[in-house]
Interface confidence: medium
């Protein structure tokens, strides 16, 4: 009875582990659309994965209601500043819900990174990290937006990313 009980416990633990939704999405060459839409993400290659969450056009889609820790980091950088750039850059995580017609702000940060360029070096770097626990219902979606996305540096999938896991 002992070994069978242990086996059952192991199966139970594994089952509960498997259904705990989690995802980590990484920046890719296709992330920046230039269309004003949310950033797009790699879902399979390298460090990226989806488990118990789905993905659609930049959005993580919740299949199981609960409390989720959601997070995103974007690497910002440039040579000087693009003309017409807003004085602040907004990086945000936004919720889409069938119950409301517009995206809802969940976590937002604002930077003024272009001030980091100096007369001796026009190259500058900055980053923005957002993370927090929110309640999400099944069918709700979370997206990342950056205004101005021209400043997001992608490269190898480790600098800019987006993820969530149920807590």
């Amino acid at each position: 009875d002992g070994p069978a009980g242990s086996w059952e416990q192991l199966i139970q633990e594994r089952r509960s582990h498997e259904v705990n939704p989690a995802a980590h999405l990484t920046g890719a060459n296709s992330s920046l659309t230039g269309s004003g839409g949310p950033l797009l993400w790699e879902t399979q290659l390298g460090l990226a994965f989806l488990r118990g969450l789905s993905y659609h056009d930049g959005a993580l889609v919740v299949t199981k209601a609960g409390y989720y820790y959601i997070y995103s980091k974007v690497q910002l950088g440039g040579v000087g500043c693009p003309l017409g750039l807003a004085s602040t850059i907004t990086h945000g995580l936004y919720k889409r819900t069938p119950r409301y017609p517009e995206e809802l702000e969940l976590l937002v940060s604002q930077q003024s990174p272009c001030g980091r360029a100096t007369s001796s070096s026009r190259v500058w770097w900055d980053s923005s990290f957002l993370g927090g626990v929110v309640h999400l219902e099944a069918g709700e979606e979370v997206v990342v937006r950056v205004l101005d996305e021209r400043l997001v540096r992608l490269r190898d999938g480790t600098r800019s990313y987006f993820g969530a896991f149920m807590v």
Epitope: G34, G77, G78, V79, G80, C81, P82, L83, G84, R122, V123, R150, L151, R153, R155
Partner: antibody, heavy 121, light 111 residues
Framework: QVQLVQSGAEVKKPGASVKVSCKAS????????VHWVRQAPGQGLEWIGA????????SYNQKFKGRATLTADKSTSTVYMELSSLRSEDTAVYYC??????????????WGQGTLVTVSS | DIVMTQSPDSLAVSLGERATINCKAS??????????MNWYQQKPGQPPKLLIY???NLESGVPDRFSGSGSGTDFTLTISSLQAEDVAVYYC?????????FGQGTKVEIK
């Protein structure tokens, strides 16, 4: 399709000013910079400056700062380049060009047909 | 200002042969793995036309016989098989910092 249509040729006397227009169509006017580049007869290309029609921000080549003024009229999707205190060496074809971005790097993907400005006494 | 120097000033190549134009910047125009260098073609009486942006990206609608390469300060525009319609002046341009500057141009002719 994207089009930039410039005003016609001008002949000006030294010391005068000239205002060249560039009417944009086929894209969201307020989303792209418009640059101005000139080319003296038989010579190469020289960047004058740029304007962002979304908010009127400008950037100038120091060589032209104080003499060149770039403006944008959102209501007509038109950008203007005014050059004052003209001298004979300002005789050139003046081009407007749309600036597109690859990250923070700007390149000129559509050009106007050019406007010949002749400065002669 | 960043000075752009092209070589040669003119080039005569047989139809179907390879044409190579070089451009040297007075300082590096690289940032984060990208080279802020663009190439344009200008035919007589016409405005310049974008061929290559960010050193190696082919502009939409440009024939794939055109290619760009290089990094840092040294860049190359290659026409793999010269066609009659490729007779023009070619300019490199840096967009690393303003004032954006152009090379003096390279005239390509048919031998």
């Amino acid at each position: 399709q994207v089009q930039l249509v410039q005003s016609g040729a001008e002949v000006k006397k030294p010391g005068a000013s000239v205002k060249v227009s560039c009417k944009a169509s086929g894209y969201t006017f307020t989303s792209y910079n418009v640059h101005w580049v000139r080319q003296a007869p038989g010579q190469g290309l020289e960047w004058i400056g740029a304007v962002y029609p979304g908010n009127g921000d400008t950037s100038y080549n120091q060589k032209f700062k104080g003499r060149a003024t770039l403006t944008a009229d959102k209501s007509t999707s038109t950008v203007y380049m005014e050059l004052s205190s003209l001298r004979s060496e300002d005789t050139a074809v003046y081009y407007c060009a749309r600036g597109s971005y690859y990250y923070t790097s700007s390149y000129f993907d559509h050009w106007g047909q050019g406007t010949l400005v002749t400065v002669s006494s | 200002d960043i000075v752009m120097t092209q070589s040669p000033d003119s080039l005569a190549v047989s139809l179907g042969e390879r044409a190579t134009i070089n451009c040297k910047a007075s300082q590096s125009v690289d940032f984060d793995g990208d080279s802020y260098m663009n190439w344009y073609q200008q035919k007589p009486g016409q405005p310049p036309k974008l061929l290559i942006y960010t050193a190696s990206n082919l502009e939409s609608g440009v024939p794939d016989r055109f290619s760009g390469s290089g990094s840092g300060t040294d860049f190359t525009l290659t026409i793999s098989s010269l066609q009659a319609e490729d007779v023009a002046v070619y300019y490199c341009q840096q967009s690393y910092e303003d004032p954006f500057t152009f090379g003096q141009g390279t005239k390509v002719e048919i031998k």
